[in-house]
């Protein structure tokens, strides 16, 4: 039994780091393998993650962490019974993938303005709480070409757009994702999408 693709890990910078790797053949990850992880720090203890299958030879492990600070560094040991298959390290702050925003809501009752709001996925005491920026994707269910991205570079989790920038009388969907420049993170997954019917009063033409 050998590791074909070494584990790579990303952290949500809150409580979970996810490591993925591939073995050289079909493997029952949960029964055959264990990933041990330990903070490089005084009095820290090794903790065990039981991996799950992720395709035939692929494994994924969700490492539970109480919290993360920028200096944290973990040792990782991948075991198959008594055999050490791979040894490595992982610094969560250098491999951050933020949590996806939630509770995306479209408010359509604000005088021809669409107000989109969502929730910051982090609690106020987490470092990322005040460092997230967002991308909002709006698209038409009827017209695949009607697809747009709005970059929200301010901290408030909301976006206002004129309803007239979208076509009237058709349904749209929106979703939002986050990233943090401070840690040069990857983008989060997209939030679940939300749907609304876009309608607004056309301005009267004056002759």
């Amino acid at each position: 039994m050998k590791v074909l693709q070494e584990p790579t890990c990303v952290s949500d910078y809150m409580s979970i780091s996810t490591c993925e790797w591939k073995m050289n053949g079909p493997t029952n990850c949960s029964t055959e393998l264990r990933l041990l992880y330990q903070l490089v720090f005084l009095l820290s203890e090794a903790h065990t993650c039981i991996p799950e299958n992720n395709g035939g030879a692929g494994c994924v492990c969700h490492l539970l962490m109480d919290d993360v600070v920028s200096a944290d560094n973990y040792t990782l040991d991948l075991w198959a019974g008594q055999q050490l298959l791979w040894k490595g390290s992982f610094k969560p702050s250098e491999h951050v993938k933020p949590r996806a925003p939630g509770n995306l809501t479209v408010h359509t009752n604000v005088s021809d303005t669409l107000l989109l709001t969502w929730s910051n996925p982090y609690p106020p005491d987490n470092y990322l709480y005040n460092h997230l920026t967002y991308a909002v994707n709006i698209w038409s269910e009827n017209d695949p070409a009607d697809f747009r991205i709005y970059n929200v570079t301010y901290l408030e989790p909301s976006l206002r757009i004129a309803a007239s920038t979208l076509k009237s009388g058709i349904s749209y969907r929106a979703r939002v994702r986050a990233w943090a420049q401070c840690y040069n993170t990857t983008w989060s997954e997209w939030s679940p999408s939300t749907k609304w019917h876009n309608s607004y009063r056309e301005p009267f033409e004056q002759h």
Partner: antibody, heavy 122, light 107 residues
Framework: EVQLVESGGGLVKPGGSLKLSCAAS????????MHWVRQAPEKGLEWVAY????????YHADTVKGRFTISRDNAKNTLFLQMTSLRSEDTAMYYC???????????????WGQGTSVTVSS | DIQMTQTPSSLSASLGDRVTISCRAS??????LNWYQQKPDGTVKLLIY???RLHSGVPSRFSGGGSGTDYSLTISNLEQEDIATYFC?????????FGGGTKLEIK
């Protein structure tokens, strides 16, 4: 409710021995590391020893190394401090304290006992 | 060993006052700084860990801050029950070491 109750303190002559106990309740004792900390009369706190949940990591302060031994019995939810070759400077209130061995290891001694008094005097 | 220097060693303040206690480490302790309260009967309780994190059940009038070698504990609105001795402790390196304590009294 987390409870730590120390016992075994008392008056002992220099060179003598004493064994302190700390009975734990209200939490899963075998999941936690444990410390002993002492406080000499009218003085500050001094760390004495640490033992992890499975007894595989044990550390003692230089001031007590070779004389004091920390141990634990997880089946009986009890922490011990065996003290030998006692000196007058070991006179202190001895506290046991719980240490969460959580992943991030950022946590301190989060619950302390009420202490047991040790007096070393001829 | 890391030396922890706590100031002042004693402090007299009035109820409702804002009180600050300082703690200096002899080397960088990377925010592994905890604060404990010892009541006159000897009872020791954790207040704040990792510089600024409030232990469960501790009133929000207690707060902590600092970095590197310099740290502080602030009680924003002093109450009668806060009469105690306060100790800082570094958790960065063994042996763990404590400050000398600050005895807080009411004027």
């Amino acid at each position: 409710e987390v409870q730590l109750v120390e016992s075994g303190g008392g008056l002992v002559k220099p060179g003598g021995s004493l064994k302190l106990s700390c009975a734990a309740s209200g939490f899963t004792f075998s999941d936690y590391g444990m410390h002993w900390v002492r406080q000499a009369p009218e003085k500050g706190l001094e760390w004495v020893a640490y033992i992890n949940s499975g007894s595989s990591k044990i550390y003692h302060a230089d001031t007590v190394k070779g004389r004091f031994t920390i141990s634990r019995d997880n089946a009986k939810n009890t922490l011990f401090l065996q003290m030998t070759s006692l000196r007058s400077e070991d006179t202190a209130m001895y506290y046991c304290a719980r240490f969460p061995t959580v992943v991030a290891a950022r946590y301190p001694m989060d619950y302390w006992g009420q202490g047991t008094s040790v007096t070393v005097s001829s | 060993d890391i030396q922890m220097t706590q100031t002042p060693s004693s402090l007299s303040a009035s109820l409702g006052d804002r009180v600050t206690i300082s703690c200096r480490a002899s080397q960088d302790i990377s925010n592994y700084l905890n604060w404990y309260q010892q009541k006159p009967d000897g009872t020791v309780k954790l207040l704040i860990y990792f510089t600024s994190r409030l232990h469960s059940g501790v009133p929000s009038r207690f707060s902590g801050g600092g970095s590197g070698t310099d740290y502080s504990l602030t009680i924003s609105n002093l109450e009668q029950e806060d009469i105690a001795t306060y100790f800082c402790q570094q958790g960065n390196t063994l042996p763990y070491t404590f400050g000398g304590g600050t005895k807080l009294e009411i004027k």
